[in-house]
Every structure is written in C-alpha cells, then in structure tokens.
C-alpha cells in the first residue's frame, strides 16, 4: 500500500491529464482526487499511466467505492478494467449493454478471461434473461459463448433471441445444450417456409427428436452429412432408411464414409439388411 | 450487522476519555469505520476515519485532539485531554461507497463540565 | 476543508407536497455528496449517495441529484413520517478537503 504523504504544494492535480505520467506512485496517491479520477476515468485511456500507476488509480477507486464502482466509472475504465479482479467485478450493477461493449472490446482478441465471465454472468443476471441484443454482442466478441453456458443457463434464453444465433456460434455446443436451444429454434423459426426454416433450423438440429426428422424428410430438405452426423443416435435409430434417403436426398451416398461412425454406425445395425441393399451402397447391417 | 459505541459518561474539563465502537457481522478488515460527533440541538461533525488498511484521516481541526486506533471488533476514539466544547453525543459509522457512511450506532453522550 | 453550505434551514409543506434542499460545496467535490434524514434521539440515516443512488431501503420519493460544487435533495409527496432533519455531506476522508456536513434542514410537515 502506498504511504500517505502530503501533496507538494501546487502538484495537486485538478484535471487529469497527460501531466500525470511524471507523477511518482506516492504523488498520485497524494495529489489525485478519487472523486476527480472517479469523473473523469474517460481520459486515462489516453495517457500512458504505467502498471504501476495503475495499482494507485485503481487503489483510490477501491478506497472511494469498495462496495462497487458506479456504472457511471465503470463505463469508462477502460483498460483499467484489466486491472480488476473477478471478486471486484462481482460488486458492481452493471445495466447498460453500451457498458457491457466498452468493457469487452478492452478485452478484444483474447480468450474469455475470469475477468469477463465474471462481468457477463453480473450483466445477464441484472437482466434476468439473455435478451437478443445481449445475445448479439456477446457472440459477435465471443463467437463460442453459448456453448459455455450449462443448460441451466440457456434455459434463460427466450426465443425471439434465436434470431441473433450464428451456425458458428453453435460449433462446440454438446446434445445437452442443443436438447435445450433447439425447442426454442424450433418456436422462433416456425412461421418460415420450408426451405428457409431449414437453413435456420439446421444448425440446431443436433437437439431434435425423432419426430420432427421424420417431419424434415418429407420436405425435400437435403441435409449434409455433417449436420446428419451431429443429430442425437437416440432421434437418428428409428428412422426408417426411407426416410433417412429423403432426408439426405444426394447427400445419402456419404453414408457410406461415415458407415463405422456414431450416429450411422448404430443406425445401419438397426436396419433390416434388404432395406440398406436399396441404397445401393453396400451397407453391412 | 451492527455498530454500537460505549464509553460515554460526564467527565471534568481536562480528563482523557476513551470511547469504543463495537461492531457486530462487519469485517474491519473490509469496511472503514468513521467517528462523528454532534452537540446537544446542532449538526452532525466529522472527527475521521480509520480505512481497512488501518490508515487515518482526521479533519483538520481534530489532529491532535483525537486518536482513533481499531481490534478486529472495535474501533477506539481516545481523547487525551477534553473541553467544556467537547460535548456531544458521538456516532460511530460504517463507511459504505461513494463517500457515504450506511451503518451508524445509536451514539454515546459524553458530557464535559465542572 | 471544503465547506458546505445547506437552504433552507427549515421547511414546511403539507402532506403530498414537495420539499427541495439545496446544499453548495466550498469547492467541487464531484460527486461524492450523500444525503441523511435524522429524527429527534437517533442516528443519521443514509438516503442517497454518490449525489443521486438511492440507498437500501430509502423510499423512491428521494431524489438526489446535482454536480460539482450544486446539490439538491427532492422529497416527492412528503409523508408524515418524513418530518426530520436532513443533512448532507460532501468529500470523502482520504483526501485533502475531507468531509463536512451541512448546517441541516429540519422538515415539518403539516
């Protein structure tokens, strides 16, 4: 902790400003008001403090508000947000999704921090739900946030936030969470015609039951293999191999390459051996 | 969570005094704690403050007349020699954010005459 | 120190009315003013901090608001249980100009 000393007569700062980087560590602490560090944090970003000039700034924000800086500071600390501790992000209110954006473009092209999983869970939790323009930006900084939330989690989600949800953003989701998004997909999508529905749906699918394939076969959809090999095995056994060519349409003949792998491993086991011949692809069931 | 003071009780001009605040389900390793004061029918006056560092800030008027020292459950305002213009029922107060102070005892009277 | 300077030093209003409290600091304090409500034989009670956030369990009728060196309290539709002395106060202990409180407002309310 920095010693108390009395500021050197005319040091006191009354605005902050680029004059500060010569102040020692113990100047700062003496000579720079909380309050006036507190109003004006917007202009710290464009004075070069070194890290250590940081530790004072921050020490006399935690000293002047250690239950929580106001969204008004928060707004502005810019990469003084690097600085804070997950336990210090935990205090604060944080409303504002143009607060949420200043914060996380600090923290642009680097891994989610503890940092700023800590401020994203404060923030959804002030909102009570993950709303779509939430959804929007938090995906657009961190493409694979969705699928770090439990499914306990995604169940916040209402459906009219689907829309902001990019094929993407659902890369590294695993059948838990999908069995969650999906329903709500399903609900946000189902007043679009056929084709466009399944270019929504699809990346979704790996959450759908068996019914609503069986469904998908009948509409001449042609799903790839790759959006067919992530369906759940439990929705994929009991379709017929009728429906799982109408399912594919052309796509069928990649059955073929993908016959020792899980889902069609398991599924061409529980197809009679005269209906596989009619794919002509040399199944063995 | 609580704050209550003791100690208070009429004293003669000259005598020391000290005065302690308790404090009940607050960590004084994670608040600071204020002393104020107010004489009989006028306004509330800032003595100072004892941070979670353990660092004080006086007012200016009351270096030297007090001095305020912390346990882990008490914080003690010692006066070494008070006056007739010392008395005043004095507060003990939780400091919170923003400047402010949200957790305050119900005061001890102290009484300074001949 | 800074100095606070609090109008006026009493009020009156009828129930439902509105009460306004001006405080004036001596020098800027940004926005570190907090406001109390303290009745006859009790402690200060905090209402406001940081000029305008409402503290926990303060009624919505309370509106701080101000900057700088000019600070007012609103009372909204002043209840019967609002006659007190209001109080604020402006700085903040770890730096030069510390704290001080204003003269007081006592509110009566008819």
């Known amino acids: 902790e920095v010693e108390k000393t009395a500021c050197p007569s005319g040091k006191k700062a009354r605005e902050i400003d680029e004059s500060l980087i010569f102040y020692k560590k113990w100047e700062l602490e003496a000579c720079v008001d909380a309050a006036l560090l507190a109003t004006q944090m917007d202009r710290v970003n464009a004075i070069p403090f070194t890290y250590e000039q940081l530790d004072v700034l921050k020490h006399k924000l935690d000293e002047l508000y250690p239950q929580g800086y106001p969204e008004s500071v928060i707004q502005h600390l810019g990469y003084l947000f690097l600085k804070m501790s997950p336990e210090d992000i935990r205090k604060w209110n944080v409303t504002s999704l143009e607060t949420l954006k200043a914060l996380l473009e600090v923290n642009k092209g680097h891994e989610m921090s503890p940092q700023v999983a800590t401020l994203i869970d404060r923030f959804v939790k002030g909102r009570g739900q993950l709303d779509k323009d939430t959804l929007d930006t938090l995906t657009a900084f961190y493409p694979g946030y969705l699928c770090s939330l439990s499914p306990e989690e995604l169940s916040s989600v209402p459906p009219s936030s689907i829309w902001a949800v990019r094929p993407q953003d659902l890369d590294t989701c695993d059948p838990r969470q999908l069995d969650v998004l999906y329903p709500k997909a399903r609900l946000a999508f189902q007043n679009m015609n056929g084709s466009e529905y399944f270019v929504k749906i699809q990346s979704f699918l790996g959450g759908a039951p068996t019914e609503d394939l069986k469904a998908l076969s009948q509409q001449n959809v042609s799903m790839d293999l790759a959006t067919f090999m992530k369906l759940r095995t439990d929705a994929v056994l009991p379709l017929t191999v009728a429906e799982v060519q109408k399912l594919l349409g052309p796509h069928v003949e990649g059955l073929k390459a993908e016959e020792r792998h899980r889902p069609v491993r398991d599924w061409i086991l529980r197809q009679r051996q005269d209906d596989l011949d009619t794919l002509g692809l040399g199944l063995q069931g | 969570q609580s704050v209550k003071e003791s100690g208070g009780r009429l004293v003669t001009p000259g005598t020391p005094l000290t005065l302690t605040c308790t404090v009940s389900?607050?960590?004084?390793?994670?608040?600071?704690m204020g002393w104020f004061r107010q004489a009989p029918g006028k306004g509330l006056e800032y003595i100072g403050t004892?941070?979670?560092?353990?660092r004080v800030y006086y007012a200016s008027w009351a270096k030297g007349r007090f001095t305020i020292s912390r346990t882990s459950t008490t914080v003690d305002l010692k006066a070494p020699s008070l006056t007739a213009e010392d008395t005043a029922t004095y507060f003990c107060?939780?400091?919170?954010?923003?400047?402010?102070?949200?957790?305050w005892g119900p005061g001890t009277l102290v009484t300074v005459s001949l | 120190d800074v100095v606070m300077t609090q109008t006026p030093a009493s009020a009156s209003e009828p129930v439902g009315g509105t009460v306004t409290i001006k405080c004036q600091a001596s020098?800027?304090?940004?926005?570190?003013l907090a406001w109390y409500q303290q009745k006859p034989g009790q402690p200060p009670k905090l209402l406001i901090y940081?000029?305008?956030t409402l503290a926990s369990g303060a009624p919505s009728r309370f509106k701080g608001s101000g900057y700088g060196t000019e600070f007012t309290l609103t009372i909204s539709g002043v209840q019967c249980e609002d006659a007190a002395t209001y109080y604020c106060?402006?700085?903040?202990?770890?730096?030069?100009?510390?704290?001080?409180f204003g003269g007081g407002t006592e509110v009566v309310v008819k």
């Open positions: 020098e800027s304090i940004y926005r570190v």
């Open positions: 106060q402006g700085g903040y202990y770890a730096d030069s100009y510390g704290i001080a």
């Open positions: 004892i941070n979670i560092g353990g």
């Open positions: 107060a939780r400091y919170y954010n923003g400047g402010s102070y949200d957790i």
């Open positions: 940081d000029t305008s």
């Open positions: 389900g607050i960590d004084l390793s994670s608040y600071a």
